[in-house]
């Protein structure tokens, strides 16, 4: 029986050009975490294997950094990064637990301010 629950950072927002940490935490189970996959829609961002460490998918290597912990850091954010992110915990013997985070990337306030008050 799967007793665990995943806590996530929930709905979060960040500024364009900035970075954000995606975090999930599995609790209420004694199951062994063998691997955590980080995903966005049908894309695999990264895998953290308990024995082998981190693998960042080549498409994201320049913008994704492992950690802290089992979390994932997204860098140089663009508005196209807005959307759902999933942490998939592969555990033994429980099976798979999934957490969801919604990220909204906003135009930076500096950019907005600059656009409104341009000097002619």
């Amino acid at each position: 029986m799967m007793t665990g629950t995943i806590e996530t950072t929930g709905n979060i927002s960040a500024e364009k050009g900035g970075s954000i940490i995606l975090q999930c935490h599995l609790s209420s189970t004694t199951a062994q975490v063998t691997q955590v996959n980080w995903e966005q829609q049908d894309q695999l961002l990264a895998i953290c294997n308990a024995d082998l460490g981190w693998h960042i998918s080549p498409s994201f290597k320049d913008r994704v950094a492992p950690g802290p912990g089992l979390g994932l850091t997204l860098q140089s954010l663009t508005v196209n990064d807005t959307g759902e992110y999933f942490c998939i915990y592969h555990t033994y013997p429980d099976g798979t637990y999934t957490g969801r985070i919604f990220l909204e990337v906003l135009e930076s306030s500096v950019a907005e301010h600059g656009a409104r008050f341009q000097i002619p």
């Epitope: 695999l44 895998i47 080549p58």
Partner: antibody, heavy 120, light 107 residues
């Protein structure tokens, strides 16, 4: 360049223990992941398990009760032990390296393979 | 376990032809797929990882595509030396599993 070489008996009797060794040159087994994969007659490949850079092991659950992977870092060798073999274990056994950080679970270096027949 | 199905176990082609080998995963594996080439009497060689990335030294006539459950390995212009068995593999989760292989015959 990384080179792997399997060695061990080509013939085993049912119920015996199969022991194979893999000698690695050009790279230290204290980095990356060191794996055993077998190919059955008729081409089917089966992933058997690994020993990691730190000495942690993973075994395919289909073999878990029969398999052991160990290493000797002073000799830069790792080993496969498969207990209670049957004719179904007749296969070509490959040792292989996996660079998880760069390629995930894709195996980038393979030994040439050693053929094992289980027969009474 | 995730099952990787290569429905065409045998494919016949001619030098210069374009050939595609398909692989279907029993569940969504995103892009965690590799392709290998095994020539007669040799060990497998890594060709593609992360569904579409060519491994070091692999000629650009070999390409990989797909995500989710459906994957394709394409040789744009088959050469005589491409005679081999081609395998897909998923590494989305352990145990990592392979397809049954597709044998490419050159006419």
């Amino acid at each position: 360049e990384v080179q792997l070489q399997e060695s061990g008996p080509g013939l085993a009797k049912p119920s015996q223990t199969l022991s194979l060794a893999c000698s690695v040159t050009g790279y230290s087994i204290t980095s990356d992941s060191w794996n055993w994969i077998r190919k059955f007659p008729g081409n089917k490949l089966e992933y058997m398990g690994y020993i990691s850079y730190s000495g942690n092991t993973y075994y395919n659950p289909s073999l878990k009760s029969r398999i052991s992977i160990t290493r000797d870092t002073s000799k830069n060798q790792f080993y496969l032990q498969l207990n209670s073999v049957t004719t179904e274990d007749t296969a070509t056994y490959y040792c292989a390296r996996l660079d998880f950080s760069n390629y995930g679970g894709a195996v980038d270096y393979w030994g040439q393979g050693t053929s094992v027949t289980v027969s009474s | 376990d995730i099952v990787m199905t290569q429905s065409h176990t045998f494919m016949s082609t001619s030098v210069g032809d374009r050939v595609s080998i398909t692989c279907k995963a029993s569940q969504n594996v995103r892009t965690a797929v590799a392709w290998y080439q095994q020539k007669p009497g040799q060990s497998p060689k890594l060709m593609i990882y992360s569904a579409s990335y060519r491994y070091t030294g692999v000629p650009d006539r070999f390409t990989g595509s797909g995500s989710g459950t459906d994957f394709t390995f394409t040789i744009s212009s088959v050469q005589a030396e491409d005679l081999a068995v081609y395998y897909c593999q998923q590494y989305y989760t352990t145990p990592w599993t392979f397809g049954g292989g597709a044998k490419l015959e050159i006419q």
